[in-house]
Interface confidence: medium
């Protein structure tokens, strides 16, 4: 069995303010079991954007049915983008445990925000 890869196919996404941004992420294996989380930025100060397992993220929706056991697409859509949302977003696979532990991160997708068309 090949080791799971986290694929973020887009190095960058550019979105107009007020629109929704779709950030793509797929994994290549169902093993190991564990949730996906999305973060903005890297390191200790990174900001949690979405947690598949728990939490309330009103601006984030999943593109596919991420609750299904066999799902391998963890792309998200973030609504009503503002300039404050600019940054690099990482899709991160966790291994199930107590607590869950980080297993592998995608390469990142840089979100840039264009001015709202007048």
């Amino acid at each position: 069995e090949e080791e799971l890869q986290v694929i973020q196919p887009d190095k960058s996404v550019s979105v107009a303010a007020g629109e929704s941004a779709i950030l793509h992420c797929t994994v290549t294996s169902l093993i190991p079991v564990g949730p996906i989380q999305w973060f903005r930025g890297a390191g200790p100060a990174r900001e949690l954007i979405y947690n598949q397992k728990e939490g309330h993220f009103p601006r984030v929706t999943t593109v596919s049915e991420s609750t299904k056991r066999e799902n391998m697409d963890f792309s998200i859509s973030i609504s009503n983008i503002t300039p404050a949302d600019a940054g690099t977003y990482y899709c991160v696979k966790f291994r199930k445990g107590s607590p869950d532990t980080e297993f592998k991160s995608g390469a990142g997708t840089e979100l840039s925000v264009r001015a709202k068309p007048s």
Partner: antibody, heavy 118, light 108 residues
């Protein structure tokens, strides 16, 4: 007209370093992800490294990871590739390539030749 | 890493004939495949993207087809300027981006 002009190639010894530059004109440089692709003598094409439109995400081929660094200066419309710890197998023409909306290459420079020889 | 295998390595044809070039991927790449032409001493030029869409300024004698793992570039009625090396490239799965080994189309 879109133009990409590489410079900085030359003859170096194994273990030495170089910095390649790619001057871009004829398009909005900061709207495009960019890549370097190389071609060894008599060989095919090999993608080397890519960078997102603001520089927040960089990707590398395994063969150069840890030895090469891609960067960009959007104020100067210039893409860079720093080559460290050069090996004889790094001998190639290095092309700067503009990425279209997805990760294929719609414009290429004419290339700059790097020769690593003792 | 997705490996792209191009065949044949060399295709010997006469002007006016049709060239059929194959590119096979080791994994499903959906329609995320491009074709490039390279002439000696020149940079590659984009011909086809998304497996079947012609790039700007590319004549309609160049056509691409396929999806998943099997792709074909067809050059109908070969012109003298079409004799070159052709490369396929997969994209859309993140790094590393990979190219096929190339097919040389030469004059018979």
């Amino acid at each position: 007209d879109v133009q990409l002009v590489e410079s900085g190639g030359g003859v170096v010894r194994p273990g030495e370093s170089l910095r390649l530059s790619c001057a871009a004109s004829g398009f909005t440089f900061s709207d495009h992800d960019m890549s370097w692709v190389r071609q060894g003598p008599g060989e095919g094409l090999e993608w080397v490294a890519g960078i997102s439109l603001r520089g927040g995400v960089t990707w590398y081929a395994d063969s150069v990871k840890g030895r090469f660094t891609i960067s960009r200066d959007n104020s100067k419309n210039t893409l860079y590739l720093r080559l460290f710890s050069l090996r004889t197998e790094d001998t190639a023409i290095y092309y700067c390539a503009r990425e279209s909306w997805n990760t294929f290459f719609d414009y290429w420079g004419l290339g700059t030749l790097v020769t690593v020889s003792s | 890493e997705i490996v792209l295998t191009q065949s044949p390595g060399t295709l010997s044809l006469s002007p006016g004939e049709t060239a059929t070039l194959s590119c096979r991927a080791s994994q499903n790449v959906r329609s995320n495949l491009a074709w490039y032409q390279q002439k000696p001493g020149q940079a590659p030029r984009l011909l086809i993207y998304d497996a079947s869409s012609r790039a700007t300024g590319i004549p309609d004698r160049f056509s691409g087809s396929g999806s998943g793992t099997d792709f074909t570039l067809t050059i109908s009625s070969l012109q003298s300027e079409d004799f070159a090396v052709y490369y396929c490239q997969q994209y859309g799965n993140g790094p590393p981006l990979t190219f096929g080994g190339g097919t040389k189309v030469e004059i018979k």
